[in-house]
């Protein structure tokens, strides 16, 4: 819809703005559900949602420094089927534990180039950036 | 770790990085599996993700101009128990479709207050919002 | 000025484990992230894992089940433990810093090496 | 998982020639470092986010490439210069860092 343009800081650039950017609290992204005590195919009765889940995942960090948000989270299924809601345990053949994927917005820090080819700070340029978000018991697909 | 600094365009500003930043294409973040068919409480044997899965859900659009990324996209489940993997109809009261939720890392459009205190372009605020991903089968709770 | 410094105990049993210790001075541990590193006798370098400033770990895929990598951020000590070592475990083992900053970009060259410290697994 | 395939894995040079070895990867890379191991002696890095010289890295050596072809360069080759030469990318996920298996540089 709109365009908004790539930035970069200039030296004389108002200090209280390069403030109010790094105070805003943002911690690392560490979904509630990041648990990696829940690395089996199991389904279990109480924790976070990725491990009550009858598609149960695990998460792994995605970290670099020169993107925003710099910590992202990629899903991983611990179970190629999903699991019996009766025991939590025994795999069901009839359904899938399938990766549900989003390409997500994401800015990367870029060196900027001034009219004279210097340096000038850095410019943000805008990705999309494929994530897995969590996995999800489907029914297979039945090829017509 | 790091600090990034918000930032705003200034005039004398090379005009290949805003053609840079507004020629990145990025299509509306359409989800594959956006479909607004599947509104029924029923598990698809075909289509998207979101309509074969056994805790199905639609997605509604979350759209603003002044925000980065503009159109963000919020399920919204279709059934409060899981189908069934044998009928892909009935529900089965034994699992829950429940939320999985995000705080996804969001960019604003804010006024820039130069020194004088005189509008300067845009700033970019960095906030944590929350968005729900998906719908996921899991076991219900037993509290101890 | 930056250094780092490997030690450990040179010769380890088959089967049983492997502890190193990376002492640095010049820099602090929370501002930047320290890899492992080994090198067989004439062989290339294998990355082994790394720890970065707030403590988050990654490892080597192959070898993640028998790799633990922990710190001491007030002692400047960066900690390798390895379990049930193999005579192909023998090699150098390096701890190097990683994750610089130029101003614009952040950089995960490894920068800074120690002088290894070489473990042989023999009984 | 990214490989990186250095070659020729051996070359040898005489003093003031030009050198050039290469290091392709399996898929596109974006980040790539070398480093240069002299016998007996830890690596050195020499290139850092091609193309840019590490600190008090003689002039004559140049990183160059993109995607999943890179090269380094040494303008002319110095007795000094006799070493083994690592490439080695950083991805964030899955989180890695390969090195390459190395080129031996021989000075004749």
């Known amino acids: 819809y709109s365009h908004w343009p790539s930035c970069c800081p200039s030296k004389g650039y108002p200090s209280e703005e390069l403030l109010r950017w790094s105070t805003v609290p943002v911690p690392p992204l560490k979904p509630a559900s990041l648990d990696f005590h829940s690395v089996s195919c199991r389904a279990s009765e109480d924790g976070p949602l990725n491990s009550r889940a009858i598609s149960p995942w695990r998460y792994e960090l995605d970290r670099d420094l020169n993107r925003l948000p710099q910590d992202l989270y990629h899903a991983r299924c611990l179970c190629p089927h999903c699991v019996s809601l009766q025991t939590g345990s025994h795999m069901d053949p009839r359904g899938n534990s399938e990766l549900l994927y989003h390409n997500q917005t994401v800015f990367y820090r870029r060196p900027c180039h001034g009219k004279k080819g210097n340096h000038k700070g850095y410019c943000l340029e805008r990705r999309l950036y494929r994530v897995s978000l969590a996995c999800v018991c489907v029914r297979p697909r039945v090829m017509g | 770790y790091s600090h990034w600094p918000s930032c705003c365009p200034s005039k004398g500003y090379p005009s290949e990085e805003l053609l840079r930043w507004s020629t990145v294409p990025v299509p509306p973040l359409k989800p594959a599996s956006l479909d607004f068919h599947s509104v029924s409480c029923r598990a698809s044997e075909d289509g998207p993700l979101n309509s074969r899965a056994i805790s199905p859900w639609r997605y509604e659009l979350d759209r603003d101009l002044n925000r980065l990324p503009q159109d963000l996209y919020h399920a919204r489940c279709l059934c409060p128990h899981c189908v069934s993997l044998q009928t892909g109809s009935h529900m089965d009261p034994r699992g829950n479709s429940e939320l999985l939720y995000h705080n996804q890392t969001v960019f604003y459009r804010r006024p820039c207050h130069g020194k004088k205190g005189n509008h300067k372009g845009y700033c970019l605020e960095r906030r944590l919002y929350r968005v729900s991903l998906a719908c996921v089968c899991v076991r219900p709770r037993v509290m101890g | 000025q930056v250094q780092l410094k490997e030690s450990g105990p040179g010769l380890v049993a088959p089967s049983q484990s492997l502890s190193i210790t990376c002492t640095v001075s010049g820099f602090s541990l929370t501002d930047y992230g320290i890899n492992w590193v080994r090198q067989p006798p004439g062989k290339g370098l294998e990355w082994l894992g790394m720890i970065w400033g707030d403590g988050v770990t990654h490892y080597n895929s192959v070898l993640k089940s028998r790799l633990s990598i922990s710190k001491d951020n007030s002692m400047s000590q960066i900690f390798l433990k390895m379990n049930s070592l193999q005579t192909d475990d023998t090699a150098r083992y390096y701890c190097?810093?990683?994750?610089?900053?130029?101003?614009?970009?952040?950089?995960?060259?490894?920068?800074?090496w120690g002088q290894g410290t070489s473990v042989t697994v023999s009984s | 998982q990214i490989v990186l395939t250095q070659s020729p894995a051996t070359m040898s040079a005489s003093p003031g020639e030009k050198v050039t070895m290469t290091c392709s990867a399996s898929s596109s890379v974006t980040y790539m470092y070398w480093y240069q191991q002299k016998t007996g002696s830890s690596p050195r890095l020499l290139i850092y986010?091609?193309?840019n010289l590490a600190s008090g890295v003689p002039v004559r050596f140049s990183g160059s490439g993109s995607g999943t072809s890179y090269s380094l360069t040494i303008s002319r080759v110095e007795a000094e210069d006799a070493a083994t030469y690592y490439c080695q990318q950083w991805s964030s996920y899955p989180h890695t860092w390969t090195f390459g298996g190395g080129t031996k540089l021989e000075i004749k």
């Open positions: 190097a810093r990683t994750l610089f900053y130029d101003g614009t970009l952040y950089y995960y060259a490894m920068d800074y």
């Open positions: 986010d091609t193309p």
